[in-house]
């Protein structure tokens, strides 16, 4: 089990001519928000098929007004990453597909109406617990900019969350056939369910239900010594006639790598190193051909006519890894100082300061409470560079000037109007709703004061019909 | 995603009552605001109850006095008593789900009603 995790940096203008109109206006003032949608392997399905590794919705972004006469700049976003948890193993290639989503907030019946702006696919390879990977997509004339990972939950732990970790018992090393869980040191890898009666002393398994024997022990269960005197061949079935047992066949015996995969025994089991397009614990899991497009970014694929050849991608100027879906990361080298974020734009860095900090690289530390008073018997307090103010009951607002307002939340549904109130709030809803946050409609048929369908439903219809 | 399953629904006669039940799974209910909506042959489908997330409640005037509407979020579901029933009340009587989180209506498949003599 583990959790995918999308970070959206940015959704402006593309480069180049045709720069898109901005999607919200003086009149109808919008935000955005963001659907991510994943698929396991590298099928580029239909976007209505399901997600059968999960789906997200973003919170919405901050309320946008395009300035007349500006050209559209890039777009408040939300807060925060986008979070897919997975229950099952992560399976290393998956699909995606991210939507940009407008909220308007005009005074429309109905309430906000959603639509769709742009929508980016992609497929990719990733191990869990690896570093961010950062992508930039094109929609039409809109660029999004993004980095994702998959991570895993204690106790799961390797590259598709499979092997499980648990704290050591001994303090000093892990038992018998278990090793400790990189890069958690200071525990191991928890043993899987084996064959019923497997010796826990002797005996270990790589799948549920088998039993493999530790060096010096064999049988079923791996509960019989091995003795290695009076017998003949160094590795044979055992003779019952002489009593002689001797090891049984090594974890390479046979070469347990599908696909060309070449084995290597380790002190536990064996390992096995694939040719390029086969993954899998041994190599069983098929390969990938240049007609699968498997080489991103504009990367060139080269050989691989059939499952059997390998192909290369050859990487387009700043990216590389062997599928080209890596960054050339000039980021790793943190640029940014203070928590700032670093983004990389192809042609320059650029930093993203957090809130107290400025210049270039943020190296500038802004006095924060210095000349700011707090509103209303409030109090200033100084964080991590970041002003703030602790307000005093009843206010609000980054200087206690406002009073607190129960109506921030946009807690009426459909376009009801809220009002603070001395008990709370009222919602005075639009025509056609009821309930204390009209949240109800009256006619749920009468679809023209309705909003617009938002994701996960089907296009013009208002509502889901299970 | 919000599966809602109704059930209770049948034939009754005038003046007598019956109670509809209504299973939500896939969130729980105490984020949710719930409503019962009836759709008689040959006319729209219409709001008989609801009852918000934080327990307010809400009737068209035909069936006030006559229905209440509860929800156990304990058990995950929302009912309608329907005591005084009349012929007009016949209809497939369908659950309703709003989501606050996310903003999403959901339906269920809907149960009959029948109150003949």
């Known amino acids: 089990a583990g959790v995918f995790e999308l970070q959206i940096h940015s959704f402006g203008p593309g480069p180049g001519p045709g720069a898109p109109r901005s999607p919200c206006s003086a009149r109808l003032p919008c935000r955005l928000f963001f659907r991510v949608c994943l698929k396991p392997g590298l099928s580029e399905e239909a976007a209505e098929s399901p997600c059968a590794l999960g789906a997200a919705l973003s919170a919405r972004g901050p309320v946008y007004t395009e300035q007349p006469g500006a050209p559209a700049p890039d777009l408040p976003l939300p807060d925060g990453l986008l979070q897919v948890p997975f229950r099952d193993a992560w399976p290393g290639t998956f699909s995606f597909i991210i939507e940009t989503w407008r909220e308007e907030l005009g005074d429309q019946i109905g309430g906000p109406a959603w639509s769709l702006l742009a929508r980016v696919a992609g497929r990719r390879r990733l191990a869990a617990g690896g570093p961010w990977a950062r992508d930039i997509q094109r929609a039409g004339a809109w660029e999004l900019r993004f980095s994702y990972r998959a991570r895993c939950e204690p106790p799961a732990v390797g590259t598709a969350c499979t092997r499980l970790c648990r704290p050591r018992s001994a303090p000093s090393r892990c038992g018998p056939g278990l090793r400790p869980c990189a890069p958690l040191e200071d525990e191991c890898e928890a043993p899987l369910v084996c064959r019923a009666g497997c010796s826990p002393e002797h005996g270990f398994c790589e799948q549920p239900g088998e039993c493999r024997c530790l060096e010096g022990w064999t049988g079923p269960l791996c509960t019989v010594p091995v003795s290695t005197s009076s017998c003949l061949s160094p590795r044979g079935p055992s003779s019952a006639t002489t009593g002689c047992l001797v090891p049984g066949p090594g974890p390479c015996d046979g070469n347990p790598c599908a696909n060309g995969g070449s084995c290597s025994e380790t002190p536990r089991s064996f390992e096995c190193t694939c040719p390029r397009g086969f993954y899998g614990l041994r190599c069983e899991v098929s390969g990938v051909t240049c007609a699968d497009g498997p080489c991103f970014n504009g990367g060139l694929c080269v050989g691989g006519a059939d499952p059997d050849s390998a192909y290369i991608c050859h990487c387009p100027p700043g990216f590389q890894g062997s599928n080209c879906e890596k960054r050339v990361d000039r980021c790793s080298l943190q640029p940014c100082r203070n928590g700032g974020l670093c983004l990389d734009l192809g042609h320059a860095l650029r930093c993203r300061c957090r809130a107290g900090f400025a210049g270039p690289r943020c190296e500038h530390d802004l006095d924060d409470c210095a000349g700011r008073a707090c509103a209303n018997g409030g109090t200033c307090v100084e964080g991590g560079g970041a002003h703030r103010c602790s307000c005093a009951l009843g206010f609000g607002g980054r200087d206690c000037r406002e009073r607190a307002d129960p109506c921030a939340a946009r807690p009426c549904a459909h376009g009801g109007r809220c009002y603070a109130h001395f008990s709370g709030l009222v919602c005075a809803c639009a025509p056609g709703y009821m309930g204390a946050r009209c949240e109800f409609p009256v006619h749920p048929d009468g679809a023209s004061a309705l909003p617009a369908a938002p994701p996960g439903l089907r296009p013009g219809d208002p509502q889901r019909y299970l | 995603e919000v599966q809602l399953v109704e059930s209770g629904g049948g034939l009754v006669q005038p003046g007598g009552s019956l109670t509809l039940s209504c299973a939500a799974s896939?969130?729980?209910?105490?984020?949710?605001?719930l409503a019962w909506y009836r759709q008689a042959p040959g006319k729209k489908r219409e709001l008989v109850a609801g009852?918000?997330?934080?327990?307010?409640?809400v009737y068209i005037d035909s069936v006030k006095g006559r229905f209440t509407i509860s929800r156990d979020n304990a058990k995950n579901s929302v009912y309608l008593q329907m005591n005084s029933l009349r012929a007009e009340d016949t209809a497939v009587y369908y659950c309703?789900?709003?989501?606050?989180?996310?903003?999403?209506?959901?339906w269920g498949q809907g149960t009959l009603v029948t109150v003949s003599s």
């Open positions: 009852i918000s997330d934080d327990g307010s409640q």
């Open positions: 309703y789900a709003y989501r606050w989180e996310d903003a999403l209506t959901y």
């Open positions: 896939g969130s729980a209910v105490s984020m949710l605001s």
